[in-house]
Amino acid sequence: AHHHHHHGENLYFQGSERNIDDCPNHRCQNGGVCVDGVNTYNCRCPPQWTGQFCTEDVDECLLQPNACQNGGTCANRNGGYGCVCVNGWSGDDCSENIDDCAFASCTPGSTCIDRVASFSCMCPEGKAGLLCHLDDAGNS
């Protein structure tokens, strides 16, 4: 079939049919890329948008039931989603265990062990208690 593109006027000739490039006047939204059609245009959408003009928000929570890990709750948003993490977890998908030792008050000389939403202190000899702040009576 005869196919000619005249750059000056954005005209395409397909067979005997004249087809104008509709992309200069496109209205693809939310990062959509215009793809010319016959007497119309279409939009190629980024992953978080859908619909003919990329105006419909993709519900990632519906499409990816495990989008949020470790018991996190998925919240759909325009152009994406977010996770509300349960205690002890953080990160975009709640996959990062919060370092509770960063805020721990284990007595100096003791070793902090991070757990999920908690920590424990490993006491040196002669110390006892949750924070290793007590003298161990057994060693006195």
């Epitope: 509709d22 200069p24 006047n25 496109h26 209205r27 693809c28 939204q29 939310n30 990062g31 959509g32 890329v33 245009y41 980024p46 003919q52 003009f53 105006t55 325009n78």
Partner: antibody, heavy 120, light 107 residues
Framework: EVQLVESGGGLVQPGGSLKLSCAVS????????MEWVRQASGKGLEWVAA??????????VYSASVKDRFTISRDDSKSTLYLQMNSLKTEDTAVYYC???????????WGQGTLVTVSS | DIQMTQSPSSVSASVGDRVTITCQTS??????LAWYQQKPGKSPKLLIY???RLQDGVPSRFSGSGSGTDYTLTISSLQPEDFATYYC?????????FGGGTKVEIK
């Protein structure tokens, strides 16, 4: 809160120039198409010009009535949209509105408007 | 350019009335239609986008319908604050075009 505030309107003689500004806040400026729409006194709304977003290379479209006379531009660092108007005609007299294209094929936020009067 | 034919140009109605405004486009706009309300001396306010989607914060007495080339805005029970001018606008392609407006006046 999304806000758009136009400025730069005034009285100008036919053939003169004027530059309108639209300062925006409350959203990521580069993510949105921005539009200029005008309204002559007692008349309807008329679209003037648009600048698409960063994802669409900030490409520009004009109405036939202002093409080659008006220039739309933006400064992302200042979150400001501009409309440079040259070779003004009496029929360009109108309130000029800056608006945000909200990603739904509709203009979801508008400025208060700035009046441009072209008269000798 | 896509032509927009909005009717009626004005309508007189009373509080509590049902008001219907229509908009016809010169070609299929694939539901890319918005409705705006404008009061004297004020900026337009978006009511409906995508032909039938209610913009956040807009009362549910406003509704939109239609597809292809024929669209309708309905105010189910007119309130005192609804007396204004209403415009349709196609967002399918540039140049964006508006209907001529419908002034809703107090009977």
């Amino acid at each position: 809160e999304v806000q758009l505030v136009e400025s730069g309107g005034g009285l100008v003689q036919p053939g003169g120039s004027l530059k309108l500004s639209c300062a925006v806040s409350g959203f990521t400026f580069s993510d949105f198409y921005m539009e200029w729409v005008r309204q002559a006194s007692g008349k309807g709304l008329e679209w003037v010009a648009a600048q698409r977003n960063k994802a669409n290379d900030f490409s520009i479209v004009y109405s036939a009535s202002v093409k080659d006379r008006f220039t739309i531009s933006r400064d992302d660092s200042k979150s400001t949209l501009y409309l440079q108007m040259n070779s003004l005609k009496t029929e360009d007299t109108a309130v000029y509105y800056c608006s945000r294209d909200g990603g739904r094929l509709a203009l979801d936020a508008w400025g208060q408007g700035t009046l441009v009067t072209v008269s000798s | 350019d896509i032509q927009m034919t909005q009717s009626p140009s004005s309508v007189s109605a009373s509080v509590g009335d049902r008001v219907t405004i229509t908009c016809q486009t010169s070609e299929d706009i694939y539901s890319g239609l918005a409705w705006y309300q404008q009061k004297p001396g004020k900026s337009p306010k978006l009511l409906i986008y995508g032909a039938s989607r209610l913009q956040d914060g807009v009362p549910s007495r406003f509704s939109g319908s239609g597809s292809g080339t024929d669209y309708t805005l309905t105010i189910s029970s007119l309130q005192p604050e609804d007396f204004a001018t209403y415009y349709c606008q196609q967002g399918f392609k540039y140049p964006l075009t508006f209907g001529g407006g419908t002034k809703v006046e107090i009977k």
